[in-house]
Structures are given as structure tokens and as C-alpha cells.
């Protein structure tokens, strides 16, 4: 004969445990029903009695089975800075997240505590590392034949246009003016132009000028290491 | 805008060779470099030389070029190679290219994007006895 | 010296199909790679610079991509025209480093 199934409350067998979903309750001494997400024990089981569930309140959830005397309060809404990525339901808790443009810099178990403005890099300089949910962007000073002429949170350095004719060469925050006849570039549709870790040859210092060796191509000497938010702005 | 190439010959080894490279429509002292490169029969490309093109423009050269290799610009329009005891393993299709520009920054003797954007048709140098 | 290895050497496609070359630099050269397209009897033509920017009247099935050490140059849809020995090279100099050129790909089309 099949074992009888026990229905809630029962004793369990010694030394035994209670099934998935339920509890021992020491005051009964029984195995007694949990409650389900969005719902919390209103009245605990007895000897004769099972667990008696109610709906979580507005603004209280649970996420997990459980059997709570009250509901856990959903966290404050989000600030400015923050989107609800999940609103405050019965069986979750809200999770705000940063906006477009912004990186957590302090991170709770479930969302972000403190947003902060991702780093935007200056002209002469392009993103070497992309922000993330959790980290600021990187900045890198544009290697010579490369150029950012935009305060950025997202611009690379790219190369200088190759012209037929220069007009003025490029530099790290202007690129290469052609006279009239067209430029020689063209992005290759589909290339996805990652940013690159900056290979020892292009970590270049902060630049002092050195007398120039022939015009147009003015060359710098370095002098000693940037300071950590070189090429970013404040904002 | 195109280059040319002239002065290939056959010569005996151990003698002296000057090429030409002659630009039109634009002028070599309007922030560009001018380089060689070679190609021996049937094998791949090989850098020699390039000069910055403006008057006493700054040279650099491929490590195996230095000594008996000479590049310089001689007018406006125009840069030479000079090759100093030529044996045959110089034997080559010569080609004169050139690089654009730009305002560097880094160390004084480092060169970047030496992209070589317009090349001549080439000029045979055969060095036999 | 900075070495620039070019693989394969030699390749065969039919129309339409795709060609995969690749050039290995012997240390990191930052993107500063350019491909080279040449015909028998002629100069080479400048196609892809700084890995991935296509030069002006470069058909667009050419792409250039990679990063560090490793480059890929790809031809999709094959053309005959494409038939030719394709090169990359280093595009950086400075005291212990050379421009150096790869080998070369043959690329025959059927």
C-alpha cells in the first residue's frame, strides 16, 4: 500500500524533516504550511490547526515562501539620478537603477544605492575603457593618427581622415581638413571599432612642447605621469 | 595627385644607384612623408626609408637600410634614394609612397600611422655581373 | 625587430564565397595596421587602415577588424576582380620598432 499522505499540521517522523514549502514550528511541534510570495503568516499553526496566510499591504512584499508575521517594506523610490527597473509589487521588492550616462558607485543586494555621472572624456581624449552598470568610464589620451574632438562619455579616438590634399593636419583633438578633392575615408559598414588597451607606446604623459622639427608636425616630449581624470570633465 | 619613379638600371654589384621620385599635383613639402619600398621579384613588400618632406626633414630607416641607403628631397617636387654597394640581393622593383602627417605627440623619432595612401608604378633595379 | 606574420599564404575562393586572412604582429601595435590590395604589375593600394577604416572606393565587403596582436582582414561576397596578393602592415616606427609588412596572401578566385 502507498504511504498515506500527511496533511498539514503533522508530526514528523523522528529525526525526520518537513517537506518543500512547509516549516516546523517549534511551539506546535508540527510540520505546518508556509506562505506563498505576496503573502505572510496572519496566524501561526497549531497542534490541530494549519498556518492561516494573508496578502501582503501596499508598499510591504515578500519574495519567497515564507512564514514572516509581516510583510517586508519595499525600499524608498527612486531618486533622480535612478529608474524603477522593478516596481514595488506584493511579491517584489522595487530596484531602481542608474539612468542613461550614469554608473552605480555604491551597490545594495538588489539595485544601487548611489548613482554617479559617467566620466566624459575631452577633446584630445576618447574612451579607452566604456562605463558599466558598475564602473566609470576610462579615459585615454588619443594616440598619434588619431583624434577625438567631442566631450564624450562613449567617443573614441579615430584615425585622421587620409586626404588627397591636407590642408591642416590632424592632431589628437582635430582631424586631418582635406582641400576640396574628397577625404579617403570610409568607416567599414559592420566594424565595430572596440576601444583598445593602451599599448605602452600610446600611453602617452602629459606633453610639453619641444622645439618644433620641421612644420606641421609639432612633436612633444613628455614629462611625467597625467593625474587619474586626466581627459575628463567634471560634469 | 600621382608619383614616379625613375633612375631603375641594371648595374654591377658593389657599384652606386640614385632613384627619383618625382611628385605632381601636389607639393612634398605640404605635410607629408616620402618613403621607399621595395619588392623583389616574386616576393613580398620590404620598407627601406621615409623623410619627412620639408627642408631638412627628419629621415628614418629600416635597420638594415642604415649606411648604404640614403633618402633626401631635392625640390619641391622631388626626393631621391640614394644605394651604395649594391649586390644582388638588392635586385627589386623600387616603389616611392608616401605617408600624411599630423601633429604628434609622444617622443621626439616616433612615427605613427605610417599609412602609405599613394604610391608610384615602381622602377626596376637589377643588380648582376 | 616586430615581425608580422601572415596566414595563409595562399588561399582559393569561388565567387560570392568569403575569404579570412589574418596577420599576427610579434607584440601589441595598438590598431595602427593597414591592409594592402596588389595586382601583378602594380603598386599595392591602400584598402583598410587604423584595422577597421576603409579607404575611400573600397567596396564594403572589405572589413578590417582585431585588436593587440592579432588582425583579420575579410572578403565577403568575392569578386573576381578581388583576385590579387593582399599584404598587412605595421604602420608605427620608432627606435626598436619597424614598420614591417606581412608576407602576403595570394587570393585566387574560382
Known amino acids: 500500500l502507498p504511504a498515506q499522505v500527511a496533511f498539514t499540521p503533522y508530526a514528523p517522523e523522528p529525526g525526520g524533516t518537513c517537506r518543500l514549502r512547509e516549516y516546523y514550528d517549534q511551539t506546535a511541534q508540527m510540520c505546518c504550511s508556509k506562505c506563498p510570495p505576496g503573502q505572510h503568516a496572519k496566524v501561526f499553526c497549531t497542534k490541530t490547526s494549519d498556518t492561516v496566510c494573508d496578502s501582503c499591504e501596499d508598499s510591504t512584499y515578500t519574495q519567497l515562501w515564507n512564514w514572516v508575521p509581516e510583510c517586508l517594506s519595499c525600499g524608498s523610490r527612486c531618486s533622480s539620478d535612478q529608474v524603477e527597473t522593478q516596481a514595488c509589487t506584493r511579491e517584489q521588492n522595487r530596484i531602481c537603477t542608474c539612468r542613461p550616462g550614469w554608473y552605480c558607485a555604491l551597490s545594495k543586494q538588489e539595485g544601487c544605492r548611489l548613482c554617479a555621472q559617467l566620466r566624459k572624456c575631452r577633446p584630445g581624449f576618447g574612451v579607452a575603457r566604456p562605463g558599466t552598470e558598475t564602473s566609470d568610464v576610462v579615459c585615454k589620451p588619443c594616440a598619434p593618427g588619431t583624434f577625438s574632438n567631442t566631450t564624450s562619455s562613449t567617443d573614441i579616438c579615430r584615425p585622421h581622415q587620409i586626404c588627397h590634399v591636407v590642408a591642416i593636419p590632424g592632431n589628437a583633438s582635430m582631424d586631418a581638413v582635406c582641400t576640396s578633392t574628397s577625404p579617403t575615408r570610409s568607416m567599414a559598414p559592420g566594424a565595430v571599432h572596440l576601444p583598445q588597451p593602451v599599448s605602452t607606446r600610446s600611453q602617452h604623459t602629459q606633453p610639453t612642447p619641444a622645439p618644433s622639427t620641421a612644420p606641421g608636425t609639432s612633436f612633444l616630449l613628455p614629462v611625467g605621469p597625467s593625474p587619474p581624470a586626466e581627459g575628463s570633465t567634471g560634469d | 595627385q600621382s608619383l614616379e619613379e625613375s633612375g631603375g638600371d641594371l648595374v654591377v654589384p658593389g657599384t652606386s644607384l640614385t632613384l627619383t621620385c618625382t611628385a605632381s599635383?601636389?607639393?612634398?613639402?605640404?605635410?607629408?612623408?616620402m618613403c621607399w619600398v621595395r619588392q623583389a621579384p616574386g616576393k613580398g613588400l620590404e620598407w627601406i626609408a621615409c623623410?619627412?618632406?620639408?627642408?631638412?626633414?627628419?629621415t628614418y630607416y629600416a635597420s638594415w637600410a642604415k649606411g648604404r641607403f640614403t633618402v633626401s628631397r631635392t625640390s619641391s617636387t622631388t626626393a631621391t634614394l640614394q644605394m651604395t654597394s649594391l649586390t644582388a640581393a638588392d635586385t627589386a622593383t623600387y616603389f616611392c609612397?608616401?605617408?600624411?602627417?599630423?601633429?604628434?605627440?609622444?617622443?621626439?623619432?616616433?612615427?605613427?600611422?605610417?599609412?602609405?595612401?599613394?604610391w608610384g608604378p615602381g622602377t626596376l633595379v637589377t643588380v648582376s655581373s | 625587430a616586430l615581425v608580422m606574420t601572415q596566414t595563409p599564404a595562399s588561399v582559393s575562393a569561388a565567387v560570392g564565397g568569403t575569404v579570412t586572412i589574418n596577420c599576427q604582429a610579434s607584440e601589441d601595435i595598438d590598431s595602427y595596421l593597414a591592409w594592402y590590395q596588389q595586382k601583378p604589375g602594380q603598386p599595392p593600394k591602400l584598402l583598410i587602415y587604423?584595422?577597421?577604416y576603409l579607404t575611400s572606393g573600397v567596396p564594403s565587403r572589405f572589413k578590417g577588424s582585431g585588436s593587440g596582436t592579432e588582425y583579420t582582414l575579410t572578403i565577403s561576397g568575392v569578386q573576381c576582380d578581388d583576385a590579387a596578393t593582399y599584404y598587412c602592415?605595421?604602420?608605427?616606427?620608432?627606435?626598436?620598432?619597424?614598420?614591417?609588412f606581412g608576407g602576403g596572401t595570394e587570393v585566387v578566385v574560382k
Open positions: 623623410i619627412y618632406a620639408v627642408s631638412s626633414g627628419s
Open positions: 609612397a608616401r605617408h600624411q602627417s599630423y601633429e604628434t605627440y609622444g617622443y621626439v623619432g616616433v612615427v605613427y600611422a605610417t599609412y602609405f595612401s599613394l
Open positions: 599635383g601636389f607639393d612634398l613639402s605640404s605635410f607629408y612623408y
Open positions: 602592415q605595421s604602420a608605427f616606427y620608432s627606435n626598436n620598432t619597424e614598420t614591417a
Open positions: 587604423y584595422a577597421s
